[in-house]
């Protein structure tokens, strides 16, 4: 009985032509949506003139359908039992699932001003930047449409810089017609306990963003895990969105459309400072903003973003230290809404439902040379938006799963 089921499962979760796993892996059968909430700044002038707390009001959801494109360049390597692929990016706006349109306007931090003043440190360059910021009538904050903010716009200040700088900015620019990878993952043919585990990403086993073990590419991409998942396991996975590997731990048993699944969550410990979780020492990349590595709940991913001062956190600075959220008014973190979870069917290791939540923030610092940042008296990690990417197994697929997998076990 059980042995036969195990044998069948082992056969069907291998990532090769003809298996159930492969069919769903190449092109997910689940509809995946990415909801965005934008933090609309209510008091831009007071912040710029008096270094006041930033008052934000979230507006959303603005929903896009994502991950609808099949993996590309899928290539099996029989020699090392791996399969490599590219994951194409695409996003389609869903008006019926959104509070407004892509043309809605938001007052947000000026991405170009914050990034350029951070990266271009030379004194004379800063003088040039200051004159061009003024000439282009740019400021510390700007009004942008949702479409511009997410997918890119030509910045008026950067367009005047007399060097070959990047003039188009956007939080996810470029996105459409790009692809993530190349990923090379184990197909499980020789060893089912390695199935879907990433061997290399962009041709390397390390990221080159972090020191020591923090730089490792661990586990799968979280879409599936090797079969026969135990509650005691720590599930490692890599997320290119946050430029690091992270992990989830068992939280509870959940019934999903009649299928028993294990809910795994990202624990607060994963976001802790090295003071509380020494393993995290290598995610602390500088001493000033992190207050000597005592701040927690924000991850400086600038090295992964060409030096732009991007910080990733959980929405509303959930699990972050008070000093991070202190300069921002209007945030209300709560676990239920803002944490990330994966609902995993333990026999197959498939993720049947998930909610990936993260927040994109940008650091802005006072600058003596740049007039629009001159009055700032402190550093701000400014929330720009947070997102909730969700997917749930469809009813039809759930029926198939119940009859072919869980039904047979019970």
């Amino acid at each position: 009985g059980d042995l036969l089921i195990q044998k069948t499962i082992k056969k069907q979760v291998v990532l090769e032509e003809g298996t159930i796993a492969f069919k769903n892996w190449v092109k997910t059968g689940t509809e995946v949506y990415r909801q965005f909430w934008i933090f609309d700044v209510q008091n831009p002038q007071e912040v710029m003139m008096n270094s006041s707390n930033i008052q934000v009001k979230q507006r959303g959801p603005y929903t896009y359908r994502v991950r609808f494109l099949a993996k590309e360049n899928v290539t099996q390597d029989a020699e090392d039992n791996t399969v490599s692929f590219l994951q194409p990016n695409g996003a389609i706006f869903e008006p019926s699932l959104s509070v407004g349109t892509e043309a809605d306007n938001f007052t947000v931090l000026n991405l170009a001003v914050a990034a350029a003043s951070h990266i271009y440190q030379n004194q004379f360059v800063q003088m040039i930047l200051n004159s061009l910021i003024n000439k282009s009538k740019s400021s510390m904050f700007q009004v942008r449409t949702l479409r511009e903010l997410l997918w890119g716009y030509r910045d008026p200040f950067l367009s005047l810089v007399p060097y070959p700088v990047t003039t188009t900015v956007g939080l996810f620019y470029p996105y459409n017609n790009t692809a993530d990878g190349v990923y090379k993952v184990f197909n499980g043919k020789d060893n089912i306990s390695k199935v879907a585990i990433i061997d290399t990403y962009k041709g390397k086993r390390n990221l080159s963003y972090w020191e020591s073990h923090c730089d490792m590419i661990n586990g799968t991409d979280a879409a599936s895990f090797p079969p026969f998942v135990e509650k005691s396991q720590v599930l490692q996975f890599f997320s290119s969105d946050i430029c690091r590997s992270i992990y989830a731990v068992f939280e509870s048993d959940v019934n999903l459309k009649g299928i028993p699944v294990y809910r795994f969550v990202l624990p607060s410990k994963a976001f802790a400072s090295p003071v509380e979780n020494p393993d995290n020492y290598c995610f602390c990349t500088e001493k000033i903003i992190s207050k000597n590595c005592t701040s927690y709940g924000v991850l400086d991913i600038s090295k992964c973003k060409e030096g732009r001062p991007v910080y990733i956190s959980l929405p509303h600075f959930l699990y972050a230290s008070p000093d991070v959220s202190e300069p921002i008014d209007g945030l209300n973190p709560n676990e239920e809404e803002h944490r990330t979870y994966l609902d995993i069917e333990p026999i197959t290791g498939f993720t049947l439902q998930f909610a990936k939540r993260l927040q994109v923030n940008l650091l802005v610092k006072p600058s003596e040379k740049i007039q629009v940042l001159k009055n700032l008296k402190r550093n701000y990690i400014v929330p720009i938006l947070w997102l909730n990417e969700t997917g749930t197994i469809g009813d039809e697929k759930a029926n198939m799963f119940r009859s072919q997998v869980t039904g047979k076990i019970n």
Epitope: I119, Q121, Y163, G307
Partner: nanobody, 124 residues
Framework: QVQLQESGGGLVQPGGSLRLSCAAS????????????MSWYRQAPGKERELVAA????????HYADSVKGRFTISRDNAKNTVYLLMNSLKPEDTAAYYC?????????????WGQGTQVTVSS
Amino acid sequence: QVQLQESGGGLVQPGGSLRLSCAASGFTSGFTFSSYAMSWYRQAPGKERELVAAITNAGDSTHYADSVKGRFTISRDNAKNTVYLLMNSLKPEDTAAYYCNAVTLQGWSEYDYWGQGTQVTVSS
């Protein structure tokens, strides 16, 4: 890797003149001398390094510290990969080590290079 070599420093009496030169070499991967904004900085003992004069990559715009305006002139010769600082009406407070700087931007990167410096002493 860009190398910058300053020359022309020395001992000069108050009211005198000097012309500093900075020769640039080692340009690679699509960058030429005319890709760089060039600057002169100075640092007196126990003081912070200060920007004295600068010229844009195209040579169409210059900047001077208030303390040297009307006395110092920065210029560049892109054919010779050299930037100059002509210093007139020198004062004892101009005594410092003078450093040449080259900077350019590409994408989201800043490429910033420094020379070893040349000493200028204004004394009677």
